[in-house]
Interface confidence: low
């Protein structure tokens, strides 16, 4: 008769370093001691008639296990083979490229290191969760790739490795390993340089805007825009809408960059560059200043008017140019009373690059001159009629304006100068009209004839 | 001729927002600055920012960094300007103005919109 | 920021008398602006680049001045001129205005 010896549990995975209880057992009669062969640590717990419980610890490589006893003077066997699975301790993407052009290829690489059995490990790349390549692990450590075409959808797209341990044919389930994900950066940055646009001319200490734009950028919010005049870097505001970046910023000449200068707009994405430059011009342009030798003027002094400006300026006050751009114009003339309020206009040219800017300035004299009342706004005698309403229309003129007073002859009595009155008959008679200021008083005689109201 | 009109005056209650509106004609909207200024009953002229309708860049006075929020659109010509977290200190009439360039200043204003915050 | 002081804060002045007030910049300025503010108004530009006269304003106005000091004069005052004036600069941001001179009819 045949017996057997049997070994249980029979072909047992399990995951490395664990342990596991085995039972030999025979249904031959004899009481033959049962060995457990194997080079893993072993311990017997328990033994009886026929059979022997072993106890395997920190299993942590595939074995093959037998048992062994002896029976009617033969030997039987049995055995049994531990699978060890074993998840990757390694899972890891290689670093991707910190930018990639949109339209070019690059390699996503894996590198998968332990894990058992191979037989049962696969290697997936993945961009989301969308599989790229699905590939086994092979060697030791396992690298798989896969060339992906870059595209705008994969900017900030997540890439990552997984590995997937398949022990569901032993009933244990799929052991998934993910790696550390890594974002990709891709780009777009036309070979085109930006649009510039900037002051030809701008004047010290003044402030103008320049905008620098370039379309077809992507993502336009990760470029990085650099905008200077001269060596003096701008202060700008980067506003993007769509792929198209516009940088702002408002430029301040001083006055030690006057002359010619550069405009630079630098616009850097993925670590490519480009650029424009404007030529702008710095000028300086004082003035004009107009002055007089005396604000204020005595009627018959003589007065100068300059007028000035800065260097390379060409004047010309009240028509008459400077003898040369640079020198200041001027004009005398013997105050008079027509000059009172009189303006003097200057006005500057400077050419900056083949273009004339002008300016202009003026200058108001005041003469003093005494008092005058003009005879031909003033009636020396008036015909009225009794209880009429009328106006004494008489003007004085003068700097400073004088006071305007008609007094009746001896009496002090005062009629209103251009404000109507009521008139009657006590009005009639001679008047003093008088003008008075600091610098004098102007007498006119107004003979007030008024004519007795009539009833019928 | 050129005409900055801004919308009518407006009645908040603390803590709330408003915008006003102010609508450019007579000149051509992205080409010129457009300011904004406050001033309360009694007081000077303040400062608030400018916007470049061209551009959409705002610069402000810091006092008003996280007050005013100026805005512009092309289409209508028409800058905006609002207000938020509005306090009793925010009741002013407010005036966008027109920047002509330095040879002429804030050179067209308009006339003004009133903003009271009262509970 | 550039603080404008502009004084006197408040005068008055009868018509034919000669105004003038002042505007002084906490650091110099290449280029003042007046603006001129009557109750219930919008300010209106006055003076430009210092010295310049805004279209429609009298000959009788006139500004002067440089680096940090700036004047407006009137030469002889007339009842319409009665109004508030404000200085401006905008060499740096902020821009600022004076606090204003009010010129009132005596």
């Known amino acids: 008769q045949e017996f057997l010896l049997r070994v249980e549990p029979q072909n047992p995975v399990l995951s490395a370093g664990g342990s596991l209880f085995v039972n030999c057992s025979t249904d031959c009669p004899s009481s033959e001691k049962i060995a457990l062969e194997t080079s893993l640590s072993k311990e017997l717990v328990a033994s009886g008639m026929g059979w022997a419980a072993f106890n395997l610890s920190n299993v942590t490589g595939n074995s093959r296990i037998l048992c062994s006893v002896y029976c009617n003077g033969s030997q039987i066997t049995g055995s049994s083979n531990i699978t060890v699975y074993g998840l990757p301790e390694r899972v890891e993407l290689a670093p991707l490229p910190p930018w990639q052009p949109v339209g070019q290829n690059f390699t996503l690489r894996c590198q998968v290191e332990g894990g058992s059995p191979r037989t049962s490990l696969t290697v997936v790349l993945l961009r989301w969760e969308e599989e790229l390549s699905r590939q086994p692990a092979v060697e030791e450590p396992a690298e798989v790739t896969a060339t992906v075409l870059a595209s705008r959808d994969d900017h900030g797209a997540p890439f990552s490795c997984r590995t997937e341990l398949d022990m569901q044919p032993q009933g244990l389930g799929l052991f998934v390993n993910t790696s550390a994900p890594r974002q990709l950066r891709t780009f777009v940055l036309p070979v085109t340089p930006p649009r510039l646009v900037a002051p030809r001319f701008l004047e010290v200490e003044t402030s103008w805007p320049v905008d620098c734009t370039l379309d077809g950028l992507f993502p336009a919010s990760e470029a990085q825009v650099y905008l200077a005049l001269g060596d003096q870097m701008l202060n700008a505001t980067v506003m993007n809408h769509g792929d198209t970046l516009t940088a702002t910023a408002t430029a301040t000449a001083r006055a030690d960059q006057e002359g010619a200068r550069e405009i630079v707009c630098n616009v850097t994405l993925g670590g490519e560059r480009r650029e424009a430059r404007e030529n702008l011009t710095v000028f300086s342009f004082l003035g004009p200043i107009v002055n007089l030798s005396e604000p204020t003027a005595h009627e018959g002094s003589t007065v100068t008017v300059s007028c000035m400006a800065g260097a390379r300026v060409q004047v010309t006050l009240d028509g008459v140019p400077a003898a040369a751009p640079g020198q200041t114009a001027q004009l005398q003339l013997n105050a008079t009373e027509s000059d009172d309020g009189r303006s003097f206009f200057c006005s500057a040219t400077l050419e900056v690059d083949g273009e004339f800017l002008h300016r202009n300035s003026s200058v108001q004299l005041r003469v003093l001159y005494g008092p005058k009342i003009d005879r031909a706004t003033c009636p020396q005698h008036l015909k009225w009629k009794d209880k009429t309403r009328h106006v004494l229309q008489c003007q004085a003129r003068g700097n400073p304006y004088p006071e305007l007073r008609c007094l009746k002859e001896g009496s002090s009595r005062e009629v209103p100068v251009g404000i109507p009155f009521f008139v009657n008959v006590t009005h009639n008679g001679t008047y003093q009209c008088q003008a008075s200021s600091s610098r004098g008083k102007y007498t006119l005689v107004v003979v007030m004839d008024i004519e007795a109201f009539s009833s019928h | 001729q050129v005409q900055l009109q801004q919308s009518g005056a407006e009645l908040a209650k603390p803590g709330a927002s408003v915008k006003m509106s102010c609508k450019a004609s007579g000149y051509t909207f992205t080409v010129y600055w457009m300011h904004w200024v406050k001033q309360r009953p009694g007081q000077g002229l303040e400062w608030i920012g400018y916007?470049?309708?061209?551009?959409?860049?705002?610069e402000y006075n810091q006092r008003f960094q996280d007050k005013a929020t100026l805005t512009a659109d092309k289409s209508s010509s028409t800058a905006y300007m609002q207000l938020s977290s509005l306090t009793s200190e925010d009741s002013a009439v407010y005036y966008c103005?027109?920047?002509?360039?330095?040879?002429?200043?804030?050179?067209?204003w308009g006339q003004g919109t009133s903003v009271t915050v009262s509970s | 920021q550039i603080v404008l002081t502009q004084s006197p804060a408040l005068m008055s002045a009868s018509p034919g008398e000669k105004v003038t007030m002042t505007c002084s910049a906490s650091?110099?300025?290449?280029?003042i602006y007046w603006y001129q503010q009557k109750p219930r108004s919008s300010p209106k530009p006055w003076i430009y680049?210092?010295?310049n006269l805004a279209s429609g304003v009298p000959a009788r106005f006139s500004g002067s001045g440089s680096g940090a000091s700036y004047s407006l004069t009137i030469s002889i005052m007339e009842a319409e001129d009665a109004a508030t004036y404000y200085c401006q600069q905008w060499k740096s941001i902020p821009l600022t205005f004076g606090a204003g001179t009010k010129l009132e009819l005596k």
């Open positions: 916007i470049n309708p061209n551009t959409d860049y705002t």
């Open positions: 103005a027109r920047w002509g360039g330095n040879s002429y200043g804030l050179d067209y």
């Open positions: 650091s110099s300025v290449s280029y």
């Open positions: 680049l210092t010295s």
